[in-house]
Every structure is written in C-alpha cells, then in structure tokens.
C-alpha cells in the first residue's frame, strides 16, 4: 500500500530510452499519443513530472517489516494526464484523471545502473513499461537477469 | 530487526590482500541495493562501493577501481569487498550499508558497526 | 563528478538554540539528498531522505529543506544528545558524501 497521499519528492525530467531515443507526448484527437522518436539535434525534450511515493511492501511478500519500502512513481508529462498501464491491451497509454490516482498509474521504481530506471507496474508485477515497435509497450520480465534488458531501460535527465 | 555485520578488518602490509565480508539479517536481501562506505580515522565518510540487488552492476570510488571487488550471494544474504594492491591511504572503518528502499540505489537506511583496516608496514 | 560543500565546518551553539547546517552541490541534485549524524564511536544514522524526509525514530525537531543545489538541516531546539558530526550525502549521480559539520554545545 503507499503509505502516504502525498510524494516524498517530485522530479521534472526528459525520459529517453538506453538507446538515447526520446520519449515525446503529441495531442491528437483530443487524446494524447506516446512516441519513441530521434529527436532533431536542437529539438526541444519533452519533460515529465515524477512524482515518488513510498510503499509498502505487501507483507506476504517480505520479511521486512516497517523495513520493506519501495518507491513507486506516477509519470505526468502535462496537467491532469498520466500514463496509465493497460494490462489488458499490454499497452501504455495517457489518461486524463483525478486524485486519487488509481493503482494502474503506480508503477515500482527500479534501477539496475546508477543512471537507468525502470518502472514495474503495480497491478501487474513482473511486468514493465517498455519500447516495442517505436511505441511503449507493457513488457514481461520472466527473471532478474533480465531486468538489465535493455528495452526496459530508461534514462532521467533534466537537459 | 535489521542486522549488518562486517568482518575481515585487521592489519596488512601495503601491496596485500584483504577479504570484508558483512552478513545481513532481518530484511529480504536480495531486494536491496548493498554498499561499503569508508572513513579514515579522524576524517569524513567515503563512499567505496555499491552493487544493485541481483548483483549484476557494480560501481567503484575511482581511487579503487581495478583494486577493490564489491560481490554479493545472495542465498548466504553476504556482500563481499576484496582488496588488493593495499595502501596505506585505505587505512579507515569500513562500514556495509543497506539501500533504503527495494530495489533502488537511494540512501543508506541501515549500517553495520564496521570493521578497522589499518595498513601499514 | 558532484562535489558537496558543507558549512560551517563547525558549529557551537546553547542548548534549546535553533541550528542550521548547509550543503551546496556543485551541480543539480534534484533533490536526491540525505543528512546522516555520526555521534563518537558509532556508525552514521540516517536522519532525512529525499531532502525533506524525515526516517522513522528521528526527533521532530530534525527537518531538512533545499532544492537545486542549496540545501539545508535544521535542528529546531538544539538537544544535549544531538552533539554529533552531520554528513549531506547525494545519490542523484554517482554517491558523494559532504566533508560534515561537526556540532558541539557551548
């Protein structure tokens, strides 16, 4: 469970891909698209606003006690929308919503090198916000081995 | 309750070799990202060296690199740092620390008590 | 490579006093900052996380504050027992701990 309501910290970032791809938000429709794009070499980053939370760890799940913390984070590239995972569809998509936010918007912070994180689903654990076919993707990692994979690796930069 | 407790400190001449192990309790270790941290006596603490929780990335103070080895198993719930090449500016408490939160690098929520390496001839 | 800067080196002050111990980055941390106290003869403690965080057992009288690269550790009302060594540490690249700020009581 998050154990509190609001963020322990929020952080305004570029996200890109290990690969150095940007990840960019466009209005289309009246709904937001995700892309996985090169940018052009004075093209402005799009930023995203993560927003860090504590959590339990599920107590079946640990011996640790009031030790067992996680971090899960909400990613907001604009007011009002975040993205959502959609388990169903094993996509990531950008939903408009109200606080409090729902479970498929948390995601369990990982980083597997110093400068690389990763975001594991909340409502479905062992399964990752990805890059597949230039689009993110929900993307399932069978074991820890594989977390080091690199097209669940993403780079926070402020630039 | 958390536990970490370092041993393997002692005395060595310059140029040898040294082996800390810190035995962790009380927590599901293999979640957490583990670090050794120094402080040369009478002087401010040092960050040595960290691995993340599966043990797969390692990273090193640079005055180490290619000296020191941070391991980990976690089926014995043990991280490890060997020394080699010693010298007498690796004289302090070496302390083991555990990540504050799973799965992160972030913050060092538990130290053990440490153990003193003294180089010297 | 991130260097921490702590002042003052030391730091005397009455008991019942309000303190403040300060740490600038050389570069943007974003926040990724903790203070740890080190009393003689024991491992550090970790005493705030995140900048503002406080760790569960700490005295209410221990906040942090900061952002960018300035950031701050104050002690409300300046106990006997909080006589220690106050090191800031960022983990927002690499790890880099502060030289600290011994605090003593006049």
């Known amino acids: 469970s998050i154990t509190g309501i609001s963020p322990i910290t929020e952080y305004l970032a570029s996200l890109s891909t290990y690969n150095d791809q940007s990840i960019t938000f466009a209005l289309e429709d009246e709904s937001y698209e995700i892309y996985v794009e090169d940018l052009k070499k004075d093209e402005k980053k799009d930023k995203v606003l993560l927003s860090y939370y504590e959590s339990q760890h599920p107590s079946n799940e640990s011996g640790d006690g009031v030790d067992g913390k996680m971090l899960m984070v909400t990613l907001s590239p604009t007011k009002d929308f975040w993205l959502h995972a959609n388990n169903k569809e094993h996509s990531v998509e950008l939903h408009k919503c109200e606080k409090p936010l729902p479970d498929q918007a948390f995601f369990v912070l990982h980083n597997m090198h110093s400068n690389c994180v990763s975001f594991e689903c909340k409502t479905d654990p062992g399964v990752f916000i990805g890059v597949k076919d230039n689009h993110l993707a929900l993307i399932k990692v069978d074991s820890s081995e594989n977390l080091c994979t690199e097209n669940i690796l993403f780079k926070l930069s402020e630039t | 309750e958390v536990q970490l407790v370092e041993t393997g400190g002692g005395l060595v001449q310059p140029g040898r070799s040294l082996k800390l192990s810190c035995v962790a309790s009380?927590?599901?270790?293999?979640?957490?990202?583990m670090y050794w941290i120094r402080q040369a006596p009478g002087m401010g603490l040092e960050w040595v060296s960290s691995i993340n929780n599966d043990g797969g990335n390692t990273y090193y103070l640079d005055s180490v690199k290619g000296r020191f080895t941070i391991s980990r198993n976690n089926a014995e719930n043990t991280v490890y740092l060997q020394m080699n090449s010693l010298r007498s500016e690796d004289t302090a408490t070496y302390y083991c620390?555990?990540?504050?939160?799973?799965?992160?690098?972030?913050?060092?929520?538990?130290w053990g008590q440490g153990t003193l390496v003294t180089v010297s001839s | 490579d991130i260097q921490m800067t702590q002042s003052p080196s030391v730091l005397s002050a009455s008991v019942g006093d309000r303190v403040t111990l300060s740490c600038k980055a050389s570069?943007?941390?974003?926040?990724?900052l903790d203070w740890y106290q080190q009393k003689v003869g024991e491992a550090p403690k970790l005493l705030i996380y995140?900048?503002?965080n406080l760790q569960t057992g700490i005295p209410s009288r221990f906040s942090g504050s900061g952002s960018g690269t300035d950031y701050t550790l104050t002690i409300s009302s300046l106990q006997p027992e909080d006589v220690a060594t106050y090191f800031c540490?960022?983990?927002?690249?690499?790890?880099?701990f502060g030289q600290g700020t011994k605090v003593e009581i006049k």
């Open positions: 009380g927590f599901t270790f293999s979640n957490y990202w």
């Open positions: 540490f960022q983990y927002n690249s690499g790890w880099t």
């Open positions: 995140f900048t503002n």
């Open positions: 620390a555990k990540g504050h939160f799973s799965y992160t690098s972030y913050s060092f929520a538990y």
């Open positions: 570069h943007n941390i974003n926040k990724h």
